[in-house]
């Protein structure tokens, strides 16, 4: 049975230029955590797996950075990068949970943080 | 072209170890994950896990963990697959694919021939 | 796991004949992470399909794949007599990767 919950940073607003911090937390179970996927609507942007380490798309290596912890740092950021982002979270034995951001991306500098928000 | 050339076929005892090799040409070996995938007589496909192309990184399924040992030697191109404590269950054919990717994407691009390993008393 | 079910077990159909395989995931399976592989007898399995649709390097046009989530089929538009051999979907989305218990397409 699946128990746990993600915890992530919700909806979110940035500057143009600027740079964001995506996070996710899983929490409420003790299944162990084999590897993270982070998709920008169906395109995989980065992945941290348990024990092979991180890997960055080529295509977003110039401005994606693993981390804080299984987070993902997003920089140079363009009004092209507003819109939905995963966390996708491979469990063993639970399976699969997912956690949704919405990042818009702000001409302005009245870039304000959403709150945070739980995906059962 | 992409060459997986593997080892030839072994006949082991229960209890006992074997390991199978795979000498990889034809590509850059030093950039590309080497998966291992086992085959029982009449059965499906099954991965069993992943090597890094530094010999630094390894993932294993947790049916083999602890078992399993995946090693490279980068000097001969070649991938190697221990598996230890066999019981005849573990009596089938494994095979070496590399990765499609540059990171361990899962997709088995392509494969060695198989290497037959009987497990018997 | 990901447990991935084929259907029919074994398809028995006549060169020329168009077949449809099929591929039902345990759980949806994100931005199509699926394979699709060929193995005739005595062979190591070739790679056909992967992203669901896109065909591998030198596989014919007459193989072709297609579905999202949980569904995903494969067709082959007129069989020829080379295509008859066993069939296996496996999705590369979830740790760790699986494989379907494979399709049979044999001649009629």
């Known amino acids: 049975m699946m128990t746990g919950t993600i915890e992530t940073t919700g909806n979110i607003s940035a500057e143009k230029g600027g740079s964001i911090i995506l996070q996710c937390h899983l929490s409420s179970t003790t299944a162990q955590v084999t590897q993270v996927n982070w998709e920008q609507q169906d395109q995989l942007l980065a992945i941290c797996n348990a024990d092979l380490g991180w890997h960055i798309s080529p295509s977003f290596k110039d401005r994606v950075a693993p981390g804080p912890g299984l987070g993902l740092t997003l920089q140079s950021l363009t009004v092209n990068d507003t819109g939905e982002y995963f966390c996708i979270y491979h469990t063993y034995p639970d399976g699969t949970y997912t956690g949704r951001i919405f990042l818009e991306v702000l001409e302005s500098s009245v870039a304000e943080h959403g709150a945070r928000f739980q995906i059962p | 072209q992409v060459q997986l050339v593997q080892s030839g076929a072994e006949v082991k005892k229960p209890g006992a170890s074997v390991k199978v090799s795979c000498k990889a040409s034809?590509?850059?070996?030093?950039?590309?994950?080497m998966h291992w995938v086992r085959q029982a007589p009449g059965q499906g496909l099954e991965w069993m896990g992943v090597i890094g192309p530094s010999g630094a990184s390894t993932s294993y399924a947790q049916k083999f963990q602890g078992r399993v040992t995946m090693t490279r030697d980068t000097s001969t191109s070649t991938v190697y697959m221990e598996l230890s404590s066999l019981r005849s269950e573990d009596t089938a054919v494994y095979y070496c694919?590399?990765?499609?990717?540059?990171?361990?994407?899962?997709?088995?691009?392509?494969w060695g021939q198989g290497t037959m390993v009987t497990v018997s008393s | 796991e990901i447990v991935l079910t084929q259907s029919p077990g074994t398809l028995s159909l006549s060169p020329g004949e168009r077949a449809t395989l099929s591929c039902r995931a345990s759980?949806?399976?994100?931005?199509?992470?699926l394979a699709w592989y060929q193995q005739k007898p005595g062979q190591a399995p070739r790679l056909l399909i992967y992203g669901a649709s896109s065909r591998a390097t030198g596989i014919p046009d007459r193989f072709s794949g297609s579905g999202s989530g949980t569904d995903f089929t494969l067709t082959i538009s007129r069989l020829e007599p080379e295509d008859f051999a066993v069939y296996y979907c496996q999705q590369y989305f979830s740790p760790p990767w699986t494989f379907g218990g494979g399709t049979k397409v044999e001649i009629k």
């Open positions: 759980q949806s399976v994100r931005s199509s992470y």
């Open positions: 034809g590509y850059t070996f030093e950039k590309y994950y």
């Open positions: 694919a590399r990765d499609h990717s540059d990171y361990w994407s899962g997709i088995l691009h392509s």
